[in-house]
Interface confidence: medium
């Protein structure tokens, strides 16, 4: 048998070997496609097939515009004018070149040592699926889990049957690299099919900022607040990226979400205790702020009242 | 004084979504955190995650991870917890609780989302 | 996952004193797990009592009180009136989330 590949929308036709000139009875094409179950028979006689495939007068099938659907197996029986059968068997794959793949969400920016998005390749449209792959600086680039992590996803169309393909990039560059150029390509995986590249993107490697010193900073000043009333904790750090912050009450870590400010209303003395938060910087381990004493006490500085913050974000969890 | 009101009960298709909301009432809504917990029937009680309504921050139990969405409206006072492709297993009674750092002190009265179809 | 367990039903009389327990099968409950106590009264009536341990929620009266007692949270009620006939319910926090144990049947005869 023989492999055809065709494109998809365009016209096939499919030489039957050994057809007589005029076609007598004696031809006769048997296909199984996703449109047939199992066989169905054409015949010269027969009726043109839902417009789909029709036998012409020199004995070939024409299939005007071929779809997803017409993959599959195509046979033609023909008696020639000796008397002697005639096969002729056909395996028909079809094809869809997508739309030019893109990167979207381009990182312009990568922080060194620590994991970066770099972005998300898209190609929409392709059939079969196809695959995209990664380069960097024009060599491929094999992903290992650790610095090198692709996720991938494919979605097929419900109604065109063509498939979306997304693959994100998340790579963690070394520090005093240079500028890296990155690039994705589609292949279809068929012969004499170049692979489709995006244009490239080139983001700046940032090297990440060792944290400064950590700051812990208190309201009301000094620690010292009324029963009843409000205590804010600010923990204050730059560095690049902002590292995560958690809370420590008497040496015991609070059960809160990662978050840059704790926010006490209502204090009472339960609440009395030296604070300080932590911070956990991916690639500098984690640092400590200096603690600070929160006491509560009758003469103290009248703390804000609880109904009197303003909903400007202060709480104990980070988004 | 403090009030957690939530929405009435709610009879839903097996494969949709519903939505249990939580209205805060006699204190800062924004100064105390939100958390959801739910009771199966005849079995104890579960944490499914919790929302700090001032900065819209959220933390989920893992199991709960795709199933809930935990959202707040600061100018409503109202916390709200979204169950996902609902099956049976979800049928139960949802209680939102104001947490103060590390103490649940009040509860609303349950809310029972029964799955059936 | 870690299990939290509790005593299945406790009997006692007005005025006595009642102590509620709650182990974890992860080992001693400390401090960090800042073990919390709640009271459900039928239909489904929860009030908060504990936090972090011993702080007690606005409201409770002060006859309540938490305590970790060896390796395990311990809730105390010293002199027990009728109306604590409930279910209550430890629960624990483990690093990110919160494990609630099955509860104790508290009967006040």
């Known amino acids: 048998g023989q492999n055809i590949t065709a494109r998809i929308g365009e016209p096939l036709m499919l030489s039957c070997k050994g057809a007589p000139k005029k076609p007598t009875q004696k031809l006769e094409w048997k296909l199984n496609t996703g449109r047939t179950e199992a066989w169905k028979v054409l015949s010269p006689q027969g009726d043109p097939w839902d417009s789909v495939a029709r036998i012409l007068p020199n004995g070939s099938l024409l299939l005007p515009a071929i779809g997803i659907v017409d993959e599959g197996t195509f046979r033609c029986r023909a008696t020639n004018r000796l008397g002697k059968e005639v096969k002729s068997n056909y395996r028909v794959r079809v094809y869809q070149i997508p739309g030019k793949p893109e990167i979207v969400n381009p990182a312009s920016e990568l922080t060194a040592n620590v994991p970066n998005k770099v972005g998300t390749c898209v190609s929409e449209g392709s059939y079969p699926a196809g695959t995209l792959s990664w380069h960097l600086d024009g060599k491929p680039l094999i992903p290992d889990g650790k610095g090198t992590v692709v996720k991938e996803e494919t979605r097929r169309h419900p109604e065109t049957g063509l498939f979306t393909l997304r693959s994100e990039l998340t790579v963690t560059p070394a520090q005093g690299g240079t500028t890296p150029t990155y690039s994705c390509s589609f292949s279809l995986g068929l012969p004499r099919r170049r692979p489709l590249n995006t244009a490239p993107i080139q983001p700046r490697v940032r090297e990440p900022l060792p944290p400064e010193g950590i700051q812990l900073l208190v309201e009301p000043e000094g620690g010292t607040v009324a029963p009843g009333g409000t205590v804010t904790l600010t923990c204050a750090i730059s560095a690049q990226p902002p590292p995560q912050i958690h809370w420590i009450k008497d040496g015991t870590p609070l059960p809160l979400a990662p978050s840059p400010v704790l926010l006490l209303p209502e204090v009472g003395h339960e609440d009395e205790g030296i604070y300080s938060c932590v911070a956990t910087h991916p690639s500098h381990g984690p640092q400590e702020s200096p603690p600070v004493n929160i006491r509560v006490t009758e003469t103290g500085d009248e703390g804000q009242a609880a109904g009197s913050v303003d909903g400007s974000g202060l709480g104990t969890l980070a988004l | 004084q403090v009030q957690l009101q939530q929405s009435g009960a709610e009879l839903v298709r097996p494969g949709t979504s519903v939505k249990v909301s939580c209205k805060a009432s006699?204190?800062?809504?924004?100064?105390?955190?939100i958390d959801w917990v739910n009771q199966r029937p005849g079995q104890g009680l579960e944490w499914i995650g919790v929302i700090n309504p001032g900065s819209g921050g959220t933390n989920y139990n893992e199991k709960f991870t795709g199933k809930a969405t935990l959202t707040a409206d600061k100018s409503s006072s109202t916390a709200y917890m979204q169950l996902s492709s609902l099956t049976s297993d979800d049928s139960a009674v949802y209680f939102c609780?104001?947490?103060?750092?590390?103490?649940?002190?009040?509860w609303g009265q349950g809310t029972s989302v029964t799955v059936s179809s | 996952q870690a299990v939290v367990t509790q005593e299945s039903a406790l009997t006692t009389s007005p005025g006595e004193t009642v102590t509620l327990t709650c182990r974890s099968s992860?080992?001693?409950?400390?401090?960090?797990?800042?073990a919390n106590w709640v009271q459900e009264k039928p239909d489904h009536l929860f009030t908060g009592l504990i936090g972090g341990t011993n702080n007690r929620a606005p409201g409770v009266p002060a006859r309540f009180s938490g305590s970790l007692i060896g390796d395990k949270a311990a809730l105390t009620i010293t002199g027990a009136q009728t109306e604590d006939e409930a279910i209550y319910f430890c629960?624990?926090?483990?690093?990110?989330?919160?494990?609630f144990g099955g509860g104790t049947k508290l009967t006040v005869l």
């Open positions: 609780a104001r947490r103060r750092v590390d103490t649940m002190d009040y």
């Open positions: 629960a624990l926090w483990y690093s990110n989330h919160w494990v």
């Open positions: 006699g204190y800062a809504f924004t100064n105390y955190l």
């Open positions: 992860t080992g001693a409950v400390t401090t960090s797990n800042y």
